[in-house]
Amino acid sequence: LEETLLNTKLETADLKWVTFPQVDGQWEELSGLDEEQHSVRTYEVCDVQRAPGQAHWLRTGWVPRRGAVHVYATLRFTMLECLSLPRAGRSCKETFTVFYYESDADTATALTPAWMENPYIKVDTVAAEHLTRKRPGAEATGKVNVKTLRLGPLSKAGFYLAFQDQGACMALLSLHLFYKKCAQLTVNLTRFPETVPRELVVPVAGSCVVDAVPAPGPSPSLYCREDGQWAEQPVTGCSCAPGFEAAEGNTKCRACAQGTFKPLSGEGSCQPCPANSHSNTIGSAVCQCRVGYFRARTDPRGAPCTTPPSAPRSVVSRLNGSSLHLEWSAPLESGGREDLTYALRCRECRPGGSCAPCGGDLTFDPGPRDLVEPWVVVRGLRPDFTYTFEVTALNGVSSLATGPVPFEPVNVTTDREVPPAVSDIRVTRSSPSSLSLAWAVPRAPSGAVLDYEVKYHEKGAEGPSSVRFLKTSENRAELRGLKRGASYLVQVRARSEAGYGPFGQEHHSQTQLDESEGWREQLA
């Protein structure tokens, strides 16, 4: 990018540059029309018969440098060929010299600084590539010369450019003074400011465009070269902030439209709001959940919104004495989540009717909560109690919901307590065909033992047809019709008003081989 300090083609008034010395044959300003018929100013000099050592100087007005360290001067000029000048002597030249002088203000006068090299700094002696030929009575013909010179380094507030003629017949058609700067550039969402290079290459720190944030790593920078070009190099740039996406060739961040969101900074575009969420404003980093829908704390910001599950279905209970097996089906609505668990709440009611939360004597296997499978075994139920179990389904957002948690209830009433197992069986007498048994009366918690049931079968004969039962109201029994010398397995259970208790441990007994042995009392 070029920034113009002076362009005579654009000047609408007389230039009125200073000449020295005040003699005939000096530089003179002319006006004319350019290709577009715009009025332009030029300077001519043609003192080809000048006195030896006589120079004609032309100095521009003071030009503020505007921070430029190096300034470029593009000269357009024509130069008359000395051979085509009939009056030209040996002092005729086809070159001129360019100088500059720096100052902090417009302090030059008609006589100062002294019109010579040092204090003026020589830039170059300019020779014409194309010479103009002039024949008497005819128009001069020849190409315009264009030369660009480099001034500097400059350090003061401004400068003057000066032209020294020592015998040329020439016209300075235009002067363009400019400096080069790197234009403001936006790349990878990073804005690099317009920069005037002060050296061969200058590092320039970038800043993120509006609604962008720095990417991880070193802060973005680019190099501005002396020629006003940005050095090509990859830029670790910026990325659009949450709620914004890159637009217009990665030069700006655009707010996500309503109904879309972008949860993180970085690349990527705005996405439609996930299920059960919405964004009513532009620039959303997260979509708000619909009423009744939530995101768990651990859910990503871009996750769909979910809701607590409905209640489990079809709870089935199987009571086995003081143990209860509960089983159920998954809820119809999972709420859109995978992290489904179950929990149980329990209340117990005594036979008298008073109810309270279940006591600590109940055990739940695998546990009362955080169940991942749809079943549980409850142990330690008390007899003749009514239990109410509420089975609830939970997920990761259940804790965020307000209002009652839906549940599926099940009521279970335990039997009154049956007698304990009969285990201490004794054989009081045995013969080849019978066994006499006795046992201690068990302590029945709910009333007296009404009777007993004896279950026996020959060892090795396991089928149901080989099992025989005998009822007795006493705590003894005689088993008849047994095989000689055979082994029998015997179990006894007691019955009270609450029902039969469990069979006790199998007792191993053997009949006699022959009669001669007689009755023999045996101890188990």
Epitope: A13, D14, E44
Partner: antibody, heavy 126, light 108 residues
Framework: QVQLVESGGGLVQPGGSLRLSCAAS????????MSWVRQAPGKGLEWVSN????????HYADSVKGRFTISRDNSKNTLYLQMNSLRAEDTAVYYC???????????????????WGQGTLVTVSS | DIELTQPPSVSVAPGQTARISCSGD??????VHWYQQKPGQAPVLVIY???KRPSGIPERFSGSNSGNTATLTISGTQAEDEADYYC???????????FGGGTKLTVL
């Protein structure tokens, strides 16, 4: 001899037309920018019109724009001013004048008049 | 467009210095030329580019221009210098020429 000689002046009725001529000699006419300047009786100088050396551009004072036309014939070394729709206030001595010349580039001229003709009187009266 | 203002008349004794002014907004930024016109004659250029003197014009004629005022100075005025003097400049379009109203110089 370097000179400019105007002719064509005279008495003309308002609304009438007149054509002034200016014959140039002693210099390279086709390299020169030329102008007409007038002076009403007892008044100051008033610039009327310019023409570039190749006739590529002409300029006029607001007071004559649309009524006067400047032209030149470089082969005849002559400058012209065609005056139409003349008014009483156009009564004046009309001078042709040469602008200061470039050394060798007829696209440019200096801003002063360095050569004048003796003038021709135009009287607009009924 | 710029307007150039001159005093209608200036009187000077022979041998004295006559100064004729020409004023206009920021006139110092423009080149000013001076013309001498004697009765019944065509104008003659006496000063151009503020202060340059054409060949054939006596050295007693000089010019300056700064600020809003250009000045024609005739040192050691002679009787033959009695004439009307006009300043002129190009307008901002650089193609239109403006003249001052003229100053009648009387040599007493």
């Amino acid at each position: 001899q370097v000179q400019l000689v105007e002719s064509g002046g005279g008495l003309v009725q308002p609304g009438g037309s007149l054509r002034l001529s200016c014959a140039a000699s002693g210099f390279t006419f086709n390299n020169s920018w030329m102008s007409w300047v007038r002076q009403a009786p007892g008044k100051g100088l008033e610039w009327v019109s310019n023409i570039t050396s190749s006739s590529s551009m002409t300029h006029y004072a607001d007071s004559v724009k649309g009524r006067f036309t400047i032209s030149r014939d470089n082969s005849k070394n002559t400058l012209y001013l065609q005056m139409n729709s003349l008014r009483a206030e156009d009564t004046a001595v009309y001078y042709c004048a040469r602008k200061g010349m470039s050394f060798y580039n007829n696209k440019y001229a200096k801003s002063m008049f360095d050569l004048w003709g003796q003038g021709t009187l135009v009287t607009v009266s009924s | 467009d710029i307007e150039l203002t001159q005093p209608p008349s200036v009187s000077v004794a022979p041998g004295q210095t006559a100064r004729i002014s020409c004023s206009g907004d920021n006139l110092g930024k423009k080149y000013v030329h001076w013309y001498q016109q004697k009765p019944g004659q065509a104008p003659v250029l006496v000063i151009y580019y503020d202060s340059k003197r054409p060949s054939g014009i006596p050295e007693r004629f000089s010019g300056s221009n700064s600020g809003n005022t250009a000045t024609l100075t005739i040192s050691g005025t002679q009787a033959e210098d009695e004439a009307d003097y006009y300043c002129s400049a190009w307008t901002t379009t650089m193609m239109h020429i403006v003249f001052g109203g003229g100053t009648k110089l009387t040599v007493l």
